[in-house]
Each structure stands twice: as C-alpha cells, then as structure tokens.
Interface confidence: medium
C-alpha cells in the first residue's frame, strides 16, 4: 500500500506516534516519506547483507528476522515480512522500540539527512487529524 501524506499522518497518530519520545508527528511522516516514499512494501538491500523493510525501512540486522541476515538480533521479535503489511501496526510498534534505544530518530538515516532541523510540521499541514 502507498499511503497518502495525510492518510499516513492520521494512521500514525492513531498508533500513538505523535510526540512519542518527544518526536512530533511531522518527524515520523517526514521519515516515512524519505525512507520509503510512503510505500509499505518497500525493501532495500544493504552492503552488509541486511535488508530494510517497510514504510520506515526497519533493518533486518537488528530489528526483525528475515531468515537470512548474518547475526540478526531480531530485537522487535517479528518476521520482517510483517513490516510490509498495509496495516502499519507492526512497523509502528517496532519503530517505538527503535526510537527508545538511545539514538532517538537518528537511527533513521533519511530522517537525519532530510528531516532533522527542518520544518517537519509542513508534513502534516492541512491534514485533518
């Protein structure tokens, strides 16, 4: 599923991401835009043999199990395929674990490079939330 901007903002808000660990909803929508272009089925492979999955591009070395990543920790205790569902519950729950890990949203390279320090509220402007 490819979400619309406001559609995703509403879904993320429903799942309790607004101001989760101090990160406003705009941060999460911005991250999803530049990680996956709002596509729940996005997958991207990394040079270390891991793969990033889903709307927030969660990595198989640390957070989920895809059955083939050397030394996978599976800290979210889920199959990576669950992160590709049109229902974003699994991605959101895992993202909450990631953002609580100590580095906050710096864990997402696209957020660091494209969202951090920008007007992230623009990503939810005009949305009925």
């Amino acid at each position: 599923k490819v979400f619309g901007r406001c559609e995703l903002a509403a879904a993320m808000k429903r799942h309790g991401l607004d101001n989760y660990r101090g990160y406003s909803l705009g941060n999460w929508v911005c991250a999803a835009k530049f990680e996956s272009n709002f596509n729940t089925q996005a997958t991207n492979r990394n040079t270390d043999g891991s793969t990033d999955y889903g709307i927030l591009q969660i990595n198989s070395r640390w957070w989920c199990n895809d059955g083939r990543t050397p030394g996978s920790r599976n800290l979210c205790n889920i199959p990576c395929s669950a992160l590709l569902s049109s229902d974003i519950t699994a991605s959101v729950n895992c993202a909450k674990k990631i953002v609580s890990d100590g580095n906050g949203m710096n864990a997402w390279v696209a957020w660091r490079n494209r969202c951090k320090g920008t007007d992230v509220q623009a990503w939810i402007r005009g949305c009925r939330l």
Epitope: D66, G67, P79, C80, S81
Partner: antibody, heavy 116, light 107 residues
C-alpha cells in the same frame, strides 16, 4: 518438514515463454525469500534473483532482467518464474530454494529444453 | 559482482584419503561463505554454512575454515559416498554468486 516441489520438465520452442512453479510446504511461505538458480553443464550455478512472497518484492540479477519474471501466490504457497523469449541458452535445470542466505532447502529442479 | 574461484577443478582421490578444497573470493566476504555437495541428477546439498558451521545431519568428517577471501572445505578420510561436485557460494552481497565447482572423483 520444509519441502519445495517444482513443476515437471518442459520442452519449448525458441521465442516461446515458460512458467515454472515451486510449491512450498512446511513453513510460513510469506516470511522467507524464494530464490531461483540456473544450472547449465559447464556453467556451474547462477543466481537469477529472488521474491519475498508476502509482499511481492523482487530483485533480479542484472544478467536476467527482462528474461525472468517472478510472482508468488500466498493462497497456494506457490512461487513462479516465467522465462520469456526463449533461446538455446536458456536450456538448463532451474532450481527454487528458500533464501536463508545459504540454501538448505532446494526444489528438485525443473529441466527446460529449448529446441526447434 | 564477487567472483569465487574454486581449485582444483578436479581432484582424484582414493577412499580413506583426506582432502582440502579451496574457494577464493575476489574481495573480502567475512565468513559469509557456504559449501554444497551435488551428485549427478540431484539438487545441491548444504554441507557448511558461514565458512565453518556444520549443517545438521552432515557427517563430522566434513569441516570448513577461512575468513575474508580464502576458504577451505576439508574432508577427513573420504568415503565413496562423498564423490561428486562441490560448490561454494557467497551471501555477503548481491548478486549471490557460486564458485565454478570442484569435482571429487575416484582415482
């Protein structure tokens, strides 16, 4: 136990297309990548690409882009590989395997012969 | 693409001999190297994963070693059922690649 059952041998004419199937049992089909491998005598084993059945995400070896197309049907736990514009170079044994990084589980192989 | 070069291409041995098969990668692949045995008209069978981890059900006479670019599959006291082709495969990066194989044959 995990099993991958491939479709039977095919004899095709040059220029035709063929669709090979790989039925998986014994594990959660949608969760694991299915990989496809080609074997020709004297050419060893070549990785064609992979599909994640749960999402339909696919990756192809550059060499096989435009030649192979992967699909999967999660209702029947079956992965498919279509090969198009067949030539004699496509005559080979084609294997599906479960993608664990390594390949512990293989299909029995489908022999494709392309001949006029 | 990562190239895997296996040597020798053919190895002629007598049952009871011990042998070593080599697989060399064109760049470092850490320990992401796996070994397979294949008999005629059969699918490959996984022997060793991650350079040295013996797969369940594989006899202990098989062992693997190496890291980086140089890897070895050793068979301690070859038995008649061990004859066939041996392939290495890397999972360090895409595309996955295989070595050209070593044929283990009876002398």
């Amino acid at each position: 136990q995990v099993q991958l059952q491939e479709s039977g041998a095919e004899v095709m004419k040059p220029g035709a297309s063929v669709k090979i199937s790989c039925k998986a049992t014994g594990y959660t089909f949608s969760t694991y990548w299915i990989e496809w491998v080609k074997q020709r005598p004297g050419h060893g084993l070549e990785w064609i690409g992979e599909i994640l059945p749960g999402s339909g995400s696919t990756y192809y070896n550059e060499k096989f882009k435009g030649k192979a197309t992967f699909t999967a049907d999660t209702s029947s736990n079956t992965a498919y590989m279509q090969l198009s514009s067949l030539t004699s170079e496509d005559s080979a044994v084609y294997y599906c395997a479960r993608g664990d990084g390594w390949y512990c589980y293989w299909g029995q192989g489908t022999t494709l012969t392309v001949s006029s | 693409d990562i190239e895997l070069t296996q040597s020798p291409a053919t190895l002629s041995v007598t049952p009871g001999d011990s042998v070593s098969l080599s697989c060399r990668a064109s760049q470092s692949i850490s320990n992401n190297l796996h070994w397979y045995q294949q008999k005629p008209h059969e699918s490959p069978r996984l022997l060793i994963k991650y350079a040295s981890q013996l797969e369940s059900g594989i006899p202990s006479r098989f062992s693997g070693s190496g890291s980086g670019t140089d890897f070895t599959l050793s068979i301690n006291s070859v038995e008649t059922e061990d004859f066939g082709m041996y392939f290495c495969q890397q999972s360090n990066s895409w595309p996955r690649t295989f070595g050209g194989g070593t044929k283990l044959e009876i002398k």
